[in-house]
């Protein structure tokens, strides 16, 4: 019977001849009557036999990750009659692991949006990383995360590629980060190769700001012959908030005379000051109102933004109109 | 802390001419509208004129329109009254006051300084 | 324009005495907007009374100030050495006027 125990070439040696192991029948007794043959795919260009020990070598260099077993014949034959000495026989040879593939992030570019402000712990994204090295042969593929830029905001999970946030962030003082993961194969161990992935976290906004009057005081006049529903002047809040986190409403706070009032344009997000009565310069010529300010959307988790409404001080004076 | 202190002041013959001036300090004075009042011996206070914090509007005492020219010069922090044509009854002691921002009245006040229009 | 009226003309009352002064208008005063100052000889007026009620800081709280509309007051409730000047109200609602003054005097 054929005798030969399982056979394994490292890939990627670069030695010419690589004595894999012996084929040999135990009918053999060692005189050169037998001659070994090897059939199959890769027999003769990547695998050779010596006919008469048996003895098998890998004369190419492998690459586990192109193919990892080859599945070859062999025969022996007695050289004086030309007989098979024992019938054909199938055997494999495989085709171990080195680590010799780093690991790579198929899936770039990443992006993700996470709130501003959203609280340490939430999940951000996960980065995964693939290794083309046998995951069953030793530490080879199995892979640890790390974060190499992105500190103090960001952690990632060495086991998963989750990344989390870490610590609170601002929209307002900056609005997106590049977060480098790297991932490195060997569990960490020396000869570990590694790949690096970078991500885009954008933060979206939230009302986490209150409108504020660009100026505390606001000097407007007014005719004494403009009629009810004039426009006499526009007042202007900022909020560093964007989209509908920055619409606002402008209402009074203070008109003892009860003659104006403030209208929101909400395409300009300006307050408008309109004479609600009409004004005489011989009895009144200096009016004073309050206005306020306030977003148009406030959750109910963010009303600790929005405690005080910011107000300002308009000064209208009425403009003499020669009477006839 | 606010200081208002007036100057120019003395005597001139009907007719003729004279700058008073009042030099400010210890506030932003180009955020601030000023104005004159002047009090004749032994007399009442009486409102002169008014300029806004950036020169854009002035307003006068019907007594002294056409007459005096309210003006301020706010790199230099210093309001000015120019008084043409002054007359006997414009003999008073002049003092430059600072508006209240929020309001109309007058918070801080000059020491004066004392006009007599007399020939 | 407004003419403020103020009444009476000298009052003549001892230290420790309350001082009541009156001022009244002859159109109505919008949005209160009516102030008292002080003055003494030989100096410029000090602000006391904004709003017609309002105290400025710094000023003791035996001065206050009522009033709406046409009158207004200023009251002195304990009168100190130093309260002995002439007082003038004035308004802002419509340009600026002031009073004719109450002179407060030592009896």
């Known amino acids: 019977g054929w005798v030969w125990n399982q056979f394994f070439v490292p890939e990627e040696m670069n030695t010419t001849s690589h004595h894999i192991g012996q084929l040999r029948s135990d009918l053999d007794n060692g005189n050169n009557s037998f001659q070994y043959k090897l059939l199959g795919a890769g027999a003769g260009s990547t695998f050779i036999i010596d006919e008469r020990t048996g003895d098998i070598y890998a004369i190419q260099k492998l690459d586990r990750e192109e193919r990892s077993l080859y599945i070859l014949r062999a025969q022996v034959i007695d050289i004086a009659t030309g007989r098979a000495v024992e019938p054909e026989s199938e055997f494999v040879i495989k085709v171990s692991d080195i680590n010799d593939n780093e690991p790579k992030f198929l899936d770039e570019p990443y992006e993700a949006i996470v709130p501003e402000m959203s609280p340490e712990g939430t999940l951000v994204i996960q980065v995964t990383a693939s290794d083309a090295d046998d995951p069953s042969s030793g530490n080879n593929a199995r892979l640890l995360y790390s974060l190499l830029q992105g500190q103090p905001y960001f952690s990632v999970e060495p086991t998963t590629g989750v990344i989390r946030i870490s610590s609170k962030m601002d929209r307002e003082l900056q609005d997106e980060y590049w977060v480098i993961i790297q991932a490195k194969d060997m569990i960490g161990q020396p000869g570990a190769l590694s790949g690096t992935t970078s991500v885009l976290i954008k933060l979206s906004d939230v009302n986490d700001n209150k409108p504020i009057f660009k100026e505390s005081l606001y000097r407007l006049t007014v005719s004494e012959s403009a009629p009810t529903g004039t426009s006499i002047g526009t007042i202007m809040a900022y909020d560093n908030d964007i989209g509908e986190n920055a619409e606002m409403d402008y209402s009074i706070e203070e008109d003892d005379s009860q003659t104006f009032d403030i209208i929101t344009n909400h395409e300009t997000q300006e307050g408008i000051v309109i004479l609600k009565k009409k004004v005489d310069f011989e009895h009144q010529n200096h009016y004073g109102i309050r206005a306020k300010v306030k977003n148009h959307h406030v959750p109910e988790q963010l009303m600790k933004y929005h405690t005080e409404a910011s107000t300002t001080f308009i000064k209208i004076q009425v403009e003499d109109v020669d009477e006839p | 802390q606010v200081q208002l202190v007036e100057s120019g002041g003395g005597v001139v013959q009907p007719g003729r001419s004279l700058r008073l001036s009042c030099a400010a300090s210890g506030f932003t004075f180009s955020s601030y509208d000023m104005h004159w009042v002047r009090q004749a011996p032994g007399k009442g206070l009486e409102w002169v004129a008014v300029i806004w914090y950036d020169g854009s509007n002035k307003y006068y005492a019907d007594s002294v329109k056409g007459r005096f020219t309210i003006s301020r010069d706010n790199s230099t922090n210093t309001l000015h009254l120019q008084m043409n044509s002054p007359r006997a009854e414009d003999t008073a002691v002049y003092y430059c006051?600072?508006?209240?921002?929020?309001?109309?009245?007058?918070?801080?006040w000059g020491q004066g300084t004392l006009v007599t229009v007399s020939s | 324009e407004i003419v403020l009226t103020q009444s009476p003309g000298t009052l003549s009352l001892s230290p420790g005495e309350r001082a009541t002064l009156s001022c009244r208008a002859s159109?109505?005063?919008?949005?209160?907007?009516l102030a008292w100052y002080q003055q003494k000889p030989g100096q410029a007026p000090r602000l006391l009374i904004y709003g017609a009620s309002s105290r400025v800081t710094g000023i003791p709280d035996r001065f206050s100030g009522s009033g709406s509309g046409t009158d207004f007051t200023l009251t002195i409730s304990r009168l100190e050495p130093e309260d002995f000047a002439v007082y003038y109200c004035q308004q802002y609602s419509n340009s600026w006027t002031f009073g004719q003054g109450t002179k407060v005097e030592i009896k």
């Open positions: 006051a600072r508006e209240y921002r929020y309001s109309w009245y007058f918070d801080y």
């Open positions: 159109q109505s005063v919008g949005s209160s907007y």
